[in-house]
């Protein structure tokens, strides 16, 4: 039975040209996290594997940095980075947990972080 929940940074906004940290946290389960995938819509951004460490997709290497922790840092943001991001936690023995973050990249300096929320 899957008892865990994923807490994410929720809906967030950031300025064009700036950076943002995408963070998810798995709680309420004793399952072992074997791997975390980060996806943007239909693109694999990065993988953090418990044994092998980080793999950043080559096409994103210039703008994506691993961490902090199991999170992901996006740099040199453009308006095209606006959209949904997913953290996919592969665990044993529970299976897969998925969290969603919506990022809006703004032209102006009025960007501010949204509230944290939970996805069961």
């Amino acid at each position: 039975m899957m008892t865990g929940t994923i807490e994410t940074t929720g809906n967030i906004s950031a300025e064009k040209g700036g950076s943002i940290i995408l963070q998810c946290h798995l709680s309420s389960t004793t399952a072992q996290v074997t791997q975390v995938n980060w996806e943007q819509q239909d693109q694999l951004l990065a993988i953090c594997n418990a044994d092998l460490g980080w793999h950043i997709s080559p096409s994103f290497k210039d703008r994506v940095a691993p961490g902090p922790g199991l999170g992901l840092t996006l740099q040199s943001l453009t308006v095209n980075d606006t959209g949904e991001y997913f953290c996919i936690y592969h665990t044993y023995p529970d299976g897969t947990y998925t969290g969603r973050i919506f990022l809006e990249v703004l032209e102006s300096s009025v960007a501010e972080h949204g509230a944290r929320f939970q996805i069961p």
Partner: antibody, heavy 118, light 107 residues
Framework: EVQLLESGGGLVQPGGSLRLSCAAS????????MNWVRQAPGKGLEWVAY????????GYADSVKGRFTISRDNSKNTLYLQMNSLRAEDTAVYYC???????????WGQGTLVTVSS | DIQMTQSPSSLSASVGDRVTITCRAS??????LNWYQQKPGKAPKLLIY???SLQSGVPSRFSGSGSGTDFTLTISSLQPEDFATYYC?????????FGGGTKVEIK
Amino acid sequence: EVQLLESGGGLVQPGGSLRLSCAASGFTFSSYSMNWVRQAPGKGLEWVAYIKSNSGTKGYADSVKGRFTISRDNSKNTLYLQMNSLRAEDTAVYYCARGPYDYWLDYWGQGTLVTVSS
Amino acid sequence: DIQMTQSPSSLSASVGDRVTITCRASQSISSYLNWYQQKPGKAPKLLIYAASSLQSGVPSRFSGSGSGTDFTLTISSLQPEDFATYYCQQSYSTPLTFGGGTKVEIK
């Protein structure tokens, strides 16, 4: 240099058993998921089974489920495929392949031929 | 199970030609699509992983694109050593499944 060397293939009668081995070297075997993929003569590639690094998670193709068992011995850097109740349609070259991050197969062995025939 | 459909099943081309092979998944597989090259009597060799990432040591004339259900492998300028069979493979879910293959022959 990464190397994968399969062995254990041969001729076996229908209903018989065989155990394939894959000896790994040149990398930290215990950190990687491993797979078996087969190719019938003149045909395409068919995934058979996989096992994650800690042996906790395994998966099988429907065509071999209940007949084949994948296992590994990380202390011996060796992957195994126990094949029971073999059928003529299991005749193929069997490859072991390394699966980093579970999503692609970056190194393959040279293959071992299994022939099931009476 | 996710079905992978490759086209064409075979093609004839000349050295220097631009060659395109397509692969379609029966459902969305995000970018979990890999391409392999196989020569007769040899094991497959990984060319492209995660739809567009070039495997280390593979010549830059090979490229991959696509996401969701439709994917493409392109060889920008075919070389003599590129005559082989090419397979796509999805790793979105088990069972892992391969396309039927595309044999690239000399015209």
